[in-house]
Interface confidence: medium
């Protein structure tokens, strides 16, 4: 168990022309707050999948009113951290969504008005117990600066918060500076001390004396960005003679820029130059947004939490497809029971029931024989959605009102002759045949 903590440092207009001055105005004062959603793993998860690791909402920030003519100050932010407790192991790799919300206070008709100003998303590797990691994300014209970390709640320890160390009530036999560790009472654990000089920002350790690097950093103390090296041949093999430290593959190896973007290395990482219609760190975000109204048939447009989707359409009942462009054939699910006919009216489903059945889905079997009478001693048999009469000998028809000629159906096989009799029929068989119907 532990807590993921998010600290928002600033939210405001990003660099470059066309950036908004402020999300609030003199006429409509507002306040900001943030919501974070966490999902485990780095997988390509659908935007609508739940925040399986948890979600948290910040307090609402101070009310801000823009002063016309005054320089735009930093927007006032809510106090405190956003904390997302997790009960199980910290997964190490996770996806996040951070939303910036605005609450307008000047328009009180029908209560306060909300709007989502920006949504950023990313996937990260993070060890619990490590230092704060800093990040900058851009969403449209807005820029969000934040730090995050995962920490274990006692008695959990370790990079996944899965090991338990709890003090025993009995006096400890461990030496000074050591703590008893469950489940082995005799095992003593030293407080985790990383290798001397290990970068507090870019390194962490799971064993005392080691220094493991976060993604993007290398070197014995995790102080060297992966894209720089003192070696003449930055891609060359490690050389024991020169003591040359070789970082991993270059950040542009394999071209991380999607959708035809071109990659160029920077001192700390890489930069993608995106073709028209795409943006994002890796040109992964399509230029189509909810502002373009991509959802048809009354679908609700929600900005995509996944970098591969700039928007998600949530379709009303009866429609499907990425833009709610396809009508669902709801009758294909055969919702009408007992042979009822399904009618999709668009706004609703209707079932036209066969005789003897009723209900919205023809689920009720009516008493077919109620109020029905069979003539001439016949008995009513219920079933199949309609009543049926089992008639006495010599009678037929739906209600046993017709005199029946038992020989009309030519029941005697192989040329046998049929004779009507009060008890039914009698077959006189042709030579060489026998049986009640001359069938043998």
């Amino acid at each position: 168990a532990g807590v993921f903590e998010l600290q928002i440092h600033s939210f405001g207009p990003g660099p470059g022309p066309g950036a908004p001055r402020s999300p609030c105005s003199a006429r409509l004062p507002c306040r900001l707050f943030f919501r974070v959603c966490l999902k485990p793993g780095l997988s390509e998860e659908a935007a609508e999948s739940p925040c399986a690791l948890g979600a948290a909402l910040s307090a609402r920030g101070p009310v801000y009113t823009e002063q016309p003519g005054a320089p735009a100050p930093d927007l006032p932010l809510p106090d405190g951290l956003l904390q997302v407790p997790f009960r199980d192991a910290w997964p190490g790799t996770f996806s996040f969504i951070i939303e910036t919300w605005r609450e307008e206070l000047g328009d009180q008709i029908g209560g306060p008005a909300w709007s989502l100003l920006a949504r950023v998303a990313g996937r990260r590797r993070l060890a619990a117990g490590g230092p704060w990691a800093r990040d900058i994300q851009r969403a449209g014209a807005w820029e969000l600066r934040f730090s995050y970390r995962a920490r274990c709640e006692p008695p959990a320890v370790g990079t996944a918060c899965t090991r338990l160390c709890r003090p025993r009530s009995a006096p400890s036999r461990c030496g000074p500076g050591l703590r008893p560790c469950a489940p082995l009472e005799d095992e003593c654990e030293a407080p985790l001390v990383c290798r001397a000089g290990c970068s507090p920002e870019h390194g962490f350790c799971e064993q005392p004396g080691e220094c493991r690097c976060l993604e993007g950093w290398t070197g014995p103390l995790c102080t060297v960005p992966v894209s720089t090296s003192s070696c003449l041949s930055p891609r060359g093999p490690s050389s024991a003679t020169t003591g040359c430290l070789v970082p991993g593959p270059g950040p542009c190896d394999g071209n991380p820029c999607a959708n035809g973007g071109s990659c160029s290395e920077t001192p700390r990482s890489f930069e993608c130059t995106c073709p028209r219609g795409f943006y994002g760190l890796r040109c992964e975000v399509s230029g189509v947004t909810c502002a373009d109204g991509p959802c048809f048939n009354g679908g609700l447009c929600v900005g995509g939490a996944d970098p591969d989707s700039a928007y998600i359409c949530h379709c009303p009942p009866g429609f499907q497809g990425s833009n709610c462009e396809k009508r669902v054939d709801r009758c294909s699910l055969q919702p009408c029971r007992n042979g009822g006919l399904c009618l999709d009216l668009g706004h609703a489903l209707r079932c036209r029931c066969r005789a003897g059945f009723a209900g919205p889905r023809c689920e009720h079997d009516l008493d077919d024989c109620a109020g029905r009478a069979c003539a001439n001693g016949g008995t009513c048999v219920e079933g199949g959605g309609a009543h049926r009469c089992s008639c006495a000998l010599g009678f037929g028809g739906r209600d046993c009102r017709e005199r029946a000629d038992p020989c009309a159906a030519r029941p005697c096989a192989h040329g046998g002759r049929c004779y009507a009799h009060f008890s039914g029929l009698v077959c006189a068989c042709a030579p060489g045949y026998m049986g009640a119907r001359c069938e043998f």
């Epitope: 999948s49 948290a56 909402l57 029908g110 209560g111 709007s115 989502l116 909810c290 609700l300 009303p316």
Partner: nanobody
Framework: EVQLVESGGGSVQAGGSLRLSCAAS????????MGWFRQAPGKEREGVAT????????YYADSVRGRFTISQDNAKNTVYLQMNSLKPEDTAMYYC??????????????????????WGQGTQVTVSS
């Protein structure tokens, strides 16, 4: 597909209490808000209370503030409406709704029906004097 199922409605004397529950299945991330609305015969549907999922932010209509409390059990994906000091004018069909504002900056009101794209079938609350 999100499905919302309300329960807990019934008849009660003025001054009494009821607790409504709304269980959500197929609940999606886009449904940032869950709310309770009500509709009395011959009247428009009106917002009663709204809660933001993943946080405790709540909104109440003026007519119920101080008497009604909305809460959420994230583990059970259930939203509750505790109604105390009920009045005859609280008599209505109560609906649970889930939805979220658009992401293009358009205004959205937590206590108004537009923007709530998922609705339950409703549960009747009758308060007699």
């Amino acid at each position: 597909e999100v499905q919302l199922v309300e329960s807990g409605g019934g008849s009660v004397q003025a001054g009494g209490s009821l607790r409504l529950s709304c269980a959500a299945s197929g609940y999606t991330y886009s449904s940032n808000f869950m709310g309770w609305f009500r509709q009395a015969p011959g009247k428009e549907r009106e917002g009663v209370a709204t809660i933001v999922s993943g946080g405790g932010t709540t909104y109440y209509a003026d007519s119920v503030r101080g008497r009604f409390t909305i809460s959420q059990d994230n583990a059970k994906n259930t939203v509750y409406l505790q109604m105390n000091s009920l009045k005859p004018e609280d008599t209505a069909m109560y609906y649970c709704a889930a939805g979220g504002p658009p992401t293009n900056g358009a205004k959205w009101y937590p206590l108004r029906p537009p923007g709530y794209n998922y609705w339950g079938q409703g549960t009747q609350v009758t308060v007699s004097s």
